[in-house]
């Protein structure tokens, strides 16, 4: 198959970076100026994550009808997904009131709420314990009417109502909660049984709206989803799977959201999903099953407050010239959070050598990135950047990657400083006491 | 193609009972709320009850409040209508309807009931 | 309850002309308002949902306005096909209808 070889001919040459960063220079540019308004500031998690004002998706609300959220019409595919980013504690509501409004019936979420001890998203849906939430704002009503917990999904059915009206719909709220915290995941085949869940419920039909996919800033692990299922749906259209070019495709769904698949990591799991995918769209039904028993979904999840380990870092394969985030103290900025596609910020010249790492570039072991997180103030320290064209301007470079890498030698610094310091105040206050 | 088909409707006698069904197909029954309407002979539509997508939830018209009930049997895409006390004024055809964007989207042809000694 | 008032209740009407029916609801519905079309022996099928906007299917010539207590429906170019009889309703529960209004050839 013509995408097998290429993927080869890619992992031997080592340039799946080269090729995310053709991409990402290729990739579309529209304007987001909704999204830069003032009063917008705190409906947006990242100042970087914008929707375009073509494709943006807008609320039936008379005083702001903004919500940081793409649809993404994929014409030939005939399919549309709404690309959103992990609703913030004041835009839940506003989140609800676009699921009801675009008519959609599933929700897929690709984080979890917390990861790398950082809040991605709110927690924007009912818990068992409190079983229904009210958002007066938008005047919706959200029940939890039953969960089924597999090893590294839950399905939720969800029952969202309207207060005004008391029409209710049945939401599918599906959430894949194991995507590790650094790279991507080992093998596609938990996310096509995952996927394949998803197309199973019927959520993705043309009955129903859009379906909403979140992960934290909409664009990573979102992208991943989306383009996987389009090139598998094109796949099956055509009968003809050597004639589905994933950069085409990827380059066609940026022209409705900026940044979609954001490391050269995520650009290559994207290819092993779509390559293992289109096994079973030609026609080997046993695979699906394979999916199913590689993923082990009968398992015991894992707990739910306890993140998996960080992987350790593999060897860098681009150097990594990032500078970490600076702490913003007195929380204008909320935390610059990272988030499950983000980076630290790297200087990115139009023009840049590969091997000056521009932002954006992934070693092999990650696919997160820091996003400035917006609530007020500027970014103190950041450095001018000229980013590719549709590309968030701040990076996609991993700021806790970056910390695990040094933290074995920052930690023995720490632990040195602490030593040493101690050292010298007991002998001080020795010496002092003894004159 | 969204179809709603009625059953069980008839002549009953005062004081009794007659349990109404829809059933449903060609669009996914579980993620909608339900309703039924209905239409005396010569006269106009009255709303008589509706029901949440999952069941949890009901609604009636004062006028039937306290004699009908509504369920649902998402596993079986039906909706019920159960009508106990009957009287005259209940004569009507009872159409089954999807509740959907705020309003009565698909209907079925409906079915009869008539109240009578 | 909020109550549905339509005028007219009936209403003569030639092929090619242009027909305006009203409703009046007895307090603000918002833009919770649908319209039907019920020919006899027929369920009710509608037209226009949330006071303007046209039901898939439905031709172009129907159409809906107004918001809070005063509505209108329209229909442009009078077709053999279009009468029947016409009904409101508000989408605020207990849900109500207006009485009909019977659109007929002159």
């Known amino acids: 198959m013509e995408m097998e070889k290429e993927f080869e001919q890619i992992d031997k040459s080592g340039s799946w970076a080269a090729i995310y960063q053709d991409i990402r220079h290729e990739a579309s540019d529209f304007p987001c100026r909704v999204a830069k308004l003032p009063k917008n500031k705190n409906r947006n998690r990242y100042r970087d994550v914008s929707p375009f004002d073509h494709s943006r998706i807008k609320l039936h609300q008379e005083d702001n009808d903004y919500i940081n959220a793409s649809l993404i019409k994929m014409e030939e595919a005939q399919r549309s997904y709404i690309l959103t980013q992990g609703p913030l504690p004041n835009t839940c509501g506003h989140f609800w009131e676009m699921v009801w409004e675009q008519k959609s019936r599933g929700v897929v979420m690709l984080n979890r709420v917390m990861e790398k001890g950082s809040l991605k998203c709110a927690q924007y849906w009912p818990q068992k314990e409190e079983k229904e939430m009210i958002f007066e704002d938008t005047n919706l009503k959200l029940t939890l009417i039953s969960e089924d917990i597999k090893s590294y999904y839950t399905v939720r059915q969800l029952e969202l109502e309207n207060l005004t009206t008391q029409e209710t719909r049945e939401i599918l709220h599906f959430h894949y909660t194991t995507w590790p915290d650094f790279g991507v995941p080992e093998s596609p085949a938990s996310f096509l049984n995952f996927l394949f869940k998803v197309r199973e419920s019927g959520s993705l039909s043309p009955e129903h709206g859009p379906v909403v996919v979140h992960c934290s800033a909409g664009i990573g692990r979102s992208g991943t989803f989306c383009l996987a299922d389009t090139c598998l749906l094109l796949m099956d259209k055509r009968k003809d799977p050597s004639s589905v070019d994933i950069k085409k495709v990827l380059l066609e769904m940026r022209k409705f959201r900026m940044g979609l698949i954001q490391t050269a990591d995520q650009l290559r799991f994207s290819y092993l999903a779509v390559i293992e995918g289109a096994k079973f769209i030609m026609g080997d039904s046993s695979v699906q099953d394979q999916w199913k028993e590689l993923s082990h979904e009968d398992l015991e999840p894992p707990p739910e407050h306890i993140p998996p380990p960080p992987r350790p870092p593999k060897r860098i394969l681009e150097p990594h010239n990032g500078k970490c985030r600076e702490f913003f103290p007195n929380h204008q900025w909320v935390k610059e959070e990272t988030q499950e596609d983000k980076d630290c910020p790297i200087k990115e010249e139009k023009g840049s050598p590969l091997n000056a790492a521009p932002y954006g570039i992934e070693s092999m072991s990650q696919d997160t990135e820091v996003r400035s997180r917006v609530v007020g103030g500027s970014l103190r320290g950041a450095q001018a950047a000229s980013p590719a064209k549709g590309e968030p301007s701040l990076p996609e470079k991993d700021e806790d990657h970056a910390l695990s890498y040094w933290k074995p030698f920052l930690v023995n610094m720490c632990v040195a400083t602490v030593l040493t310091a101690g050292a010298y105040l007991c002998y001080r206050f020795l010496f002092n006491s003894n004159t | 193609e969204v179809q709603l088909l009625e059953s069980g409707g008839g002549l009953v006698q005062p004081g009794g009972s007659l349990r109404l069904s829809c059933a449903a197909s060609?669009?996914?029954?579980?993620?909608?709320?339900m309703s039924w309407v209905r239409q005396a002979p010569g006269k106009g539509l009255e709303w008589v009850s509706s029901?949440?997508?999952?069941?949890?939830?009901?609604s009636y018209a004062d006028s039937v409040k306290g004699r009908f009930t509504i369920s649902r049997d998402n596993s079986k895409n039906t909706l019920y209508l159960q009508m106990n006390s009957l009287r005259a004024e209940d004569t009507a055809v009872y159409y089954c309807?999807?509740?959907?964007?705020?309003?009565?989207?698909?209907w079925g042809q409906g079915t009869l009931v008539t109240v009578s000694s | 309850d909020i109550q549905m008032t339509q005028s007219p209740s009936s209403l003569s009407a030639s092929v090619g002309d242009r027909v305006t029916i009203t409703c009046r609801a007895s307090?603000?519905?918002?833009?919770?308002l649908n319209w039907y079309q019920q020919k006899p022996g027929k369920a009710p099928k509608l037209l226009i949902y949330?006071?303007?906007s046209l039901q898939s299917g439905v031709p172009s010539r129907f159409s809906g306005s107004g918001s809070g207590t005063d509505f209108t429906l329209t229909i442009s170019s009078l077709q053999p096909e279009d009468f029947a009889t016409y009904y409101c309703?508000?989408?605020?529960?207990?849900?109500?209808f207006g009485q009909g209004t019977k659109l007929e050839i002159k």
């Open positions: 307090q603000s519905i918002s833009s919770y």
């Open positions: 309807a999807r509740w959907f964007s705020s309003a009565f989207d698909y």
């Open positions: 060609g669009f996914t029954f579980s993620y909608y709320s």
């Open positions: 029901i949440s997508s999952s069941g949890g939830g009901t």
């Open positions: 949330a006071a303007s």
């Open positions: 309703q508000q989408g605020v529960p207990p849900y109500t």
